[in-house]
């Protein structure tokens, strides 16, 4: 019949429904570089996976243009406040695009998690979750940054993570 | 034409697009058991529903293998801190699989919500949200746990909940 | 062949897969009205977009019946606590439906972000994230409310936002 081309596309699409781009990356010992760069992530071991998205130096890279729900959680914790800590911890998702020289803020949270500077002896924990829909072109990248990253707690990939899926 | 079998599959898939597995379960008076088990949930009344997922003793059960965005929010609150409260409240999503005897941590948050033990007279509120993409095989289950669950506040199903959908 | 009608539907659906309803609205200077109404949102500039959903006076309006993952984040912050502030900040997503005269609570968080009233000199930040799956009929609306909205911080649309997509 005359539907050949479209038919093949539909068959392909049916198969690739299970290939809707998605990823979940997990925190690892190497996530915190101290270099001022974005957090780095585990892409294969344990709960981590990439399906239809690429990874490069901390960034999820879109292979297919469209709208993506992107998310990240970071586990914060400490005993009192480290010296020199600003009153704000900033956790954000940022886009890198060839069309613009600087990273673009997408989703950002600010928190004051560690209480007063005088309570130096107190163990505290806090968590920051971000999620939202953004548009990505092919080759555009999303990264996670935390300032001050000294407060990010990593253990087994369940407490700090980064992911996305096409909507 | 020769596309019969595939055609039926495509028609079926078009119909079942609206049956993409999804669920949203809500907190109820019976959610907190005090038994050390996971939280239990309302599956039918009010905002709660199951579509292509099953429920069993607090667990969402996958009927179809694939990647799911799973999420949970718990409302925490109290007047001061309860006796015996650790400095950490842990809120987590855990997987149960026939392939492994113990629950597997998927997504976890730790928080120190209720301030210092000395502030016994102070009403406080906090909320913990978790969400992320995980792979589930048919029959695998996801549950929510909160330690210490004495701090979870239930009222009308809007403040503490648990859900998932296939991505 | 005899599949004509259905074929057109399938072709249409393949094309409209990219038109799965989705939206992401961002906070703007005009978001906080002080009128007791819901928060208002930017729908076009910057990261904001509407795809298969409408917007009206702060509300996302469903054009297609189904289950939607709806979400909102608000950035809270201040220096101490404003006079008259209740000990609780409530951040919620609410449904408006022609079938019921009052707004229906969907997803709600309560937080005590600004510490004790005596700590008036301290800058603090906190963030509240909500997300969950709800059913919307055509014409039903979802809005975001924050009580007390005086504590919502707006800057560039990345810290306070509101979105949805069909699942």
């Amino acid at each position: 019949d005359g539907h050949g081309g479209s038919w093949e596309q539909l068959i392909q699409e049916r198969r690739s429904h299970q290939n809707n781009p998605a990823a979940h990356l997990t925190g690892a010992n190497s996530s915190l570089t101290g270099s001022g760069g974005p957090l780095l992530w585990e892409t294969q071991l344990g709960l981590a996976f990439l399906r239809g998205l690429d990874y490069h130096d901390g960034a999820l890279v879109a292979n297919k243009a469209g709208y993506y729900y992107i998310y990240s959680k970071v586990q914060l914790g400490g005993v009192g406040c480290p010296l020199g800590l600003a009153s704000t911890i900033t956790h954000g998702l940022y886009k890198r695009t060839p069309r613009y020289p600087e990273e673009l803020e997408l989703l950002v949270s600010q928190q004051s998690p560690c209480g007063r500077a005088t309570s130096n002896s107190r163990v505290w924990w806090d968590s920051s979750f971000l999620g939202g829909v953004v548009h990505l072109e092919v080759g555009e990248e999303v990264v996670v940054r935390v300032l001050d990253e000294r407060l990010v707690r990593l253990r087994d990939g369940t407490r700090s993570y980064f992911g996305a899926f096409m909507v | 034409d020769g596309h019969g079998g595939s055609w039926e599959q495509l028609i079926q898939e078009r119909r079942s697009h609206q049956n993409n597995p999804a669920a949203h379960l809500t907190g109820a008076n019976s959610s907190l058991t005090g038994s050390g088990g996971p939280l239990l949930w309302e599956t039918q009344l009010g905002l709660a529903f199951l579509r292509g997922l099953d429920y069993h003793d607090g667990a969402l059960v996958a009927n179809k293998a694939g990647y799911y965005y799973i999420y949970s929010k718990v409302q925490l609150g109290g007047v001061g801190c309860p006796l015996g409260l650790a400095s950490t409240i842990t809120h987590g999503l855990y997987k149960r699989t026939p392939r492994y005897p113990e629950e597997l941590e998927l997504l976890v948050s730790q928080q120190s919500p209720c301030g210092r033990a000395t502030s016994n007279s102070r009403v406080w509120w906090d909320s913990s949200f978790l969400g992320g993409v995980v792979h589930l095989e048919v029959g695998e289950e996801v549950v929510v746990r909160v330690l210490d669950e004495r701090l979870v506040r239930l009222r009308d199903g809007t403040r503490s909940y648990f859900g998932a959908f296939m991505v | 062949d005899g599949h004509g009608g259905s074929w057109e539907q399938l072709i249409q659906e393949r094309r409209s897969h990219q038109n799965n309803p989705a939206a992401h609205l961002t906070g703007a200077n005009s978001s906080l009205t002080g009128s007791g109404g819901p928060l208002l949102w930017e729908t076009q500039l910057g990261l904001a977009f509407l795809r298969g959903l409408d917007y009206h006076d702060g509300a996302l309006v469903a054009n297609k019946a189904g289950y939607y993952y709806i979400y909102s984040k608000v950035q809270l912050g201040g220096v101490g606590c404003p006079l008259g502030l209740a000990s609780t900040i409530t951040h919620g997503l609410y449904k408006r439906t022609p079938r019921y005269p009052e707004e229906l609570e969907l997803l709600v968080s309560q937080q005590s972000p600004c510490g004790r009233a005596t700590s008036n000199s301290r800058v603090w930040w906190d963030s509240s994230f909500l997300g969950g799956v709800v059913h919307l009929e055509v014409g039903e609306e979802v809005v975001v409310r924050v009580l007390d909205e005086r504590l919502v911080r707006l800057r560039d649309g990345t810290r306070s936002y509101f979105g949805a997509f069909m699942v």
């Epitope: - | 005090g34 007047v79 309860p82 006796l83 015996g84 650790a86 007279s121 009403v123 004495r150 506040r153 | -």
Partner: antibody
Framework: QVQLVQSGAEVKKPGASVKVSCKAS????????VHWVRQAPGQGLEWIGA????????SYNQKFKGRATLTADKSTSTVYMELSSLRSEDTAVYYC??????????????WGQGTLVTVSS | EIVLTQSPATLSVSPGERATLSCKAS??????????MNWYQQKPGQPPRLLIY???NLESGIPARFSGSGSGTEFTLTISSLQSEDFAVYYC?????????FGQGTKLEIK
């Protein structure tokens, strides 16, 4: 069934200390707070404090802080209340009581039979 | 601390009649839709016995003639039809914050 059995009556001199025990049975000892309440002859009820046997955490009425010490022994499911620097106005019946699991509703659903402590020179 | 004031100090009622006991708190004891007020009965030589918890919930094993009501700062214990075994001292207790405090008691006596 839930039972709280207290030690016997005590007579003490002013300035001395007394240690009253409360043995619990019929429930998971480490899951519930145990509170101590006293009642002077012909008077009302006064809360002294509570202990969480799960980890030994304690909370005291400021009035008794420094004089009362609450402890729990998981191996014997027994809670102890020690009151030091006794004075005549400490003469009272001392009760242990189990607190509800859900801490915000700290009602006392089971009580010991009471221990009379008499402080007299 | 939260002060609880019970009234009357003594209440004389005939068997079969209704008894209403009052308890007022110096500040609200409400939290998240619940009122953290409890009621106990005490007979001579016995420990107190829990009747009502969180203002209106009847403890298991307690006869249905006992009921509790109120919110905020004002609470009531009602005994709908007094039986001979109900004559005792009744205490209210707040569990909103520590120190947990009791009212001074209401003595319910036979008229």
């Amino acid at each position: 069934q839930v039972q709280l059995v207290q030690s016997g009556a005590e007579v003490k001199k002013p300035g001395a200390s007394v240690k009253v025990s409360c043995k619990a049975s019929g429930y998971t000892f480490t899951s519930y707070n145990v509170h101590w309440v006293r009642q002077a002859p012909g008077q009302g009820l006064e809360w002294i404090g509570a202990v969480y046997p799960g980890n030994g955490d304690t909370s005291y009425n400021q009035k008794f802080k420094g004089r009362a010490t609450l402890t729990a022994d998981k191996s014997t499911s027994t809670v102890y209340m020690e009151l030091s620097s006794l004075r005549s106005e400490d003469t009272a019946v001392y009760y242990c009581a189990r607190g509800s699991y859900y801490y915000t509703s700290s009602y006392f659903d089971h009580w010991g039979q009471g221990t009379l402590v008499t402080v007299s020179s | 601390e939260i002060v609880l004031t019970q009234s009357p100090a003594t209440l004389s009622v005939s068997p079969g009649e209704r008894a209403t006991l009052s308890c007022k708190a110096s500040q609200s004891v409400d939290f998240d839709g619940d009122s953290y007020m409890n009621w106990y009965q005490q007979k001579p030589g016995q420990p107190p016995r829990l009747l009502i918890y969180t203002a209106s919930n009847l403890e298991s094993g307690i006869p249905a003639r006992f009921s509790g009501s109120g919110s905020g700062t004002e609470f009531t214990l009602t005994i709908s039809s007094l039986q001979s075994e109900d004559f005792a001292v009744y205490y209210c207790q707040q569990s909103y914050e520590d120190p947990f405090t009791f009212g001074q008691g209401t003595k319910l006596e036979i008229k």
